[in-house]
């Protein structure tokens, strides 16, 4: 058993039929010695008396809020949560496996630049009685500070018969140099509690590997005189690291007809303009990627030809 | 491939295309190592990230863009180490910090060159003959060093009398390639920045 936060404890259980469970001793936080009784949750049934209560925790019915009282007055609470281990593996029932970039990916993180700020998100089908807390650091043996905000519900989606909820959190490395060469990864730890079930999820990464620039901005078309051709221009996104001559981007330019049958034309360029033959109903799209370290491409910025 | 490719555009910072070739070569070599050594811990997640230049050179600090010198987090370990002149410096751009930066890059390349050559000598003794260093990568390191044209003492190639442990050597190769790729990215960023300024 270990303390998650004040008056909240996690009992780690090997989860299999007829498992013996864990013996837990609860101590009432009071100077009083006599006349103390114990109850569980909303029940008025007295479970025991005395300053300590010994219980055998085997299943979720044994978890919950234990309260010690004296003469109708509440003295203290202890909330017991269960963390299940099945076949030597901690349960992952609360979050959904996103399977990207690989199986058993529960947390996904992205950074728009090298400033040390990043966002992580996760998915669940659970809608109520759910809390998350997030901690992060650079390295684990001698951790350096990363500050994370509160996790918030950022999106709801309908997937077939199920509703899916996306939660996200923003974190910022306390002293980040955009030009630094990372040798220790960022560690992100998420504690998830659903009713009386506790689970924890972790992710480890270098900022350089989770970079995904915002789409290029101000994508514009300028018709060229006496020609079917147009000059396409765009700019670095505002959120990208500066100076741009050091943190350079490369771009992918695509011309796509309305119907899927029409040939798609796609090229790469380091410049922020190109000349394009604009056909009726076609669209021009541009996306960005770090020029020197190939992490993710940005989403597309698009403009219609008409 | 028929005609030789022409020299870089006039006025172009002379080391830029060498540094781009370097990044391409080390990225290709790393990819080859990951594929060939698929049953060894050779991915970014599996290896220990070591920097053989740590405490010996200060490339990131010495080559910091002016715009980042206001960022306190970037100035933690700004040391001054080398000062000399090299051929990548167009005279009007010659400055103390730039010379320091380019000589630091040169020292990095020299250190990695020695490590890679030593390692290749060991890998050539491996009866499995599983992986060797790409000669193109070694040539590109050499070209960039020549373009930087700093005079410094030659570092003797390390030789070891004991029987090489090929498993350890291959893991060390992965560690070196990952670190060198990260440094090659920094070098490319620096050259691009200097070319624009």
């Amino acid at each position: 058993i270990w303390e998650l936060k004040k008056d909240v404890y996690v009992v780690e259980l090997d989860w299999y039929p007829d498992a013996p469970g864990e013996m837990v001793v609860l101590t009432c936080d009071t100077p009083e010695e006599d006349g103390i009784t114990w109850t569980l949750d909303q029940s008025s049934e007295v479970l025991g008396s005395g300053k300590t209560l010994t219980i055998q925790v085997k299943e979720f019915g044994d978890a919950g809020q234990y309260t010690c009282h004296k003469g109708g007055e509440v003295l203290s609470h202890s909330l017991l949560l269960l963390h299940k281990k099945e076949d030597g593996i901690w349960s992952t029932d609360i979050l959904k496996d996103q399977k990207e970039p690989k199986n058993k990916t529960f947390l996904r993180c992205e950074a728009k630049n090298y400033s040390g700020r990043f966002t992580c998100w996760w998915l669940t089908t659970i809608s109520t009685d759910l809390t998350f807390s997030v901690k992060s650091s650079r390295g684990s043996s001698d951790p350096q500070g990363v500050t994370c905000g509160a996790a918030t519900l950022s999106a709801e989606r309908v997937r077939g018969d199920n509703k899916e909820y996306e939660y996200s959190v923003e974190c910022q490395e306390d002293s980040a140099c955009p030009a630094a060469e990372e040798s220790l990864p960022i560690e992100v730890m998420v504690d998830a509690v659903h009713k009386l079930k506790y689970e924890n999820y972790t992710s480890s990464f270098f900022i350089r590997d989770i970079i995904k620039p915002d789409p290029p901005k101000n994508l514009q078309l300028k018709p060229l005189k006496n020609s079917r051709q147009v000059e396409v221009s765009w700019e670095y996104p505002d959120t990208w690291s500066t100076p741009h001559s050091y943190f350079s981007l490369t771009f992918c330019v695509q011309v796509q007809g309305k119907s899927k049958r029409e040939k798609k034309d796609r090229v790469f360029t380091d410049k922020t303009s190109a000349t394009v033959i604009c056909r009726k109903n076609a669209s021009i799209s541009v996306r960005a990627q770090d020029r020197y370290y190939s992490s993710s491409w940005s989403e597309w910025a698009s403009v219609p030809c008409s | 491939r028929n005609l030789p490719v022409a020299t870089p555009d006039p006025g172009m910072f002379p080391c830029l295309h060498h540094s781009q070739n370097l990044l391409r070569a080390v990225s290709n070599m790393l990819q080859k190592a990951r594929q060939t050594l698929e049953f060894y811990p050779c991915t970014s997640e599996e290896i220990d990230h070591e920097d053989i230049t740590k405490d010996k050179t200060s490339t990131v600090e010495a080559c910091l863009p002016l715009e980042l010198t206001k960022n306190e987090s970037c100035l933690n370990s700004r040391e001054t180490s080398f000062i000399t002149n090299g051929s990548c410096l167009a005279s009007r751009k010659t400055s103390f910090m730039m010379a320091l930066c380019l000589s630091s890059i040169y020292e990095d390349l020299k250190m990695y060159q020695v490590e890679f050559k030593t390692m290749n000598a060991k890998l050539l003794m491996d009866p499995k003959r599983q992986i060797f260093l790409d000669q193109n990568m070694l040539a590109v390191i050499d070209e960039l060093m020549q373009a930087l044209n700093f005079n410094s003492e030659t570092v003797p190639q390390k030789s070891s009398l004991e029987e090489p442990d090929f498993y350890k050597t291959k893991i060390k190769l992965c560690i070196l390639l990952h670190a060198f790729r990260i440094r090659a990215v920094t070098i490319d960023r620096v050259m691009s920045y200097l070319n624009a300024s």
Partner: nanobody, 124 residues
Framework: QVQLVESGGGLVQPGGSLRLSCAAS????????MAWFRQAPGKEREFVAT????????DYADSVKGRFTISRDNTKNTVYLQMNSLKHEDTALYYC?????????????????WGQGTQVTVSS
């Protein structure tokens, strides 16, 4: 192995037009970008224009924008350079190049395969 053969060069008066062709053999080039470069005597080889695999996306050197048009016919494995309003300073040996990639590169070192060139002379 890719072979590139340029043709269409010649002597032309200032203000005149020429159309250069670059025929490729040894490989179908419909998936790759193609480019034109030029080299005047005693000068560096300079970028003129480059075109995407399908032919909808191009890039031009500032000095030729609005006067030159690059195009391609993938059924013939050929790239063209239509040169209008020619000036004295357009006099050069014009080369066709590819690197079997999809980058709109503007530097000669980005291209690995080159033709032998076709001479364009603009003179009155």
């Amino acid at each position: 192995q890719v072979q590139l053969v340029e043709s269409g060069g010649g002597l032309v008066q200032p203000g005149g037009s020429l159309r250069l062709s670059c025929a490729a053999s040894g490989r179908t080039l419909s998936s790759y970008t193609m480019a034109w470069f030029r080299q005047a005597p005693g000068k560096e080889r300079e970028f003129v224009a480059t075109i995407s695999p399908v032919g909808f996306i191009m890039d031009y050197a500032d000095s030729v924008k609005g006067r030159f048009t690059i195009s391609r016919d993938n059924t013939k494995n050929t790239v063209y350079l239509q040169m209008n309003s020619l000036k004295h300073e357009d006099t050069a040996l014009y080369y066709c190049a590819t690197d079997l990639g999809r980058k709109l590169g503007t530097q000669s070192r980005e291209y690995g395969y080159w033709g032998q060139g076709t001479q364009v002379t603009v003179s009155s």
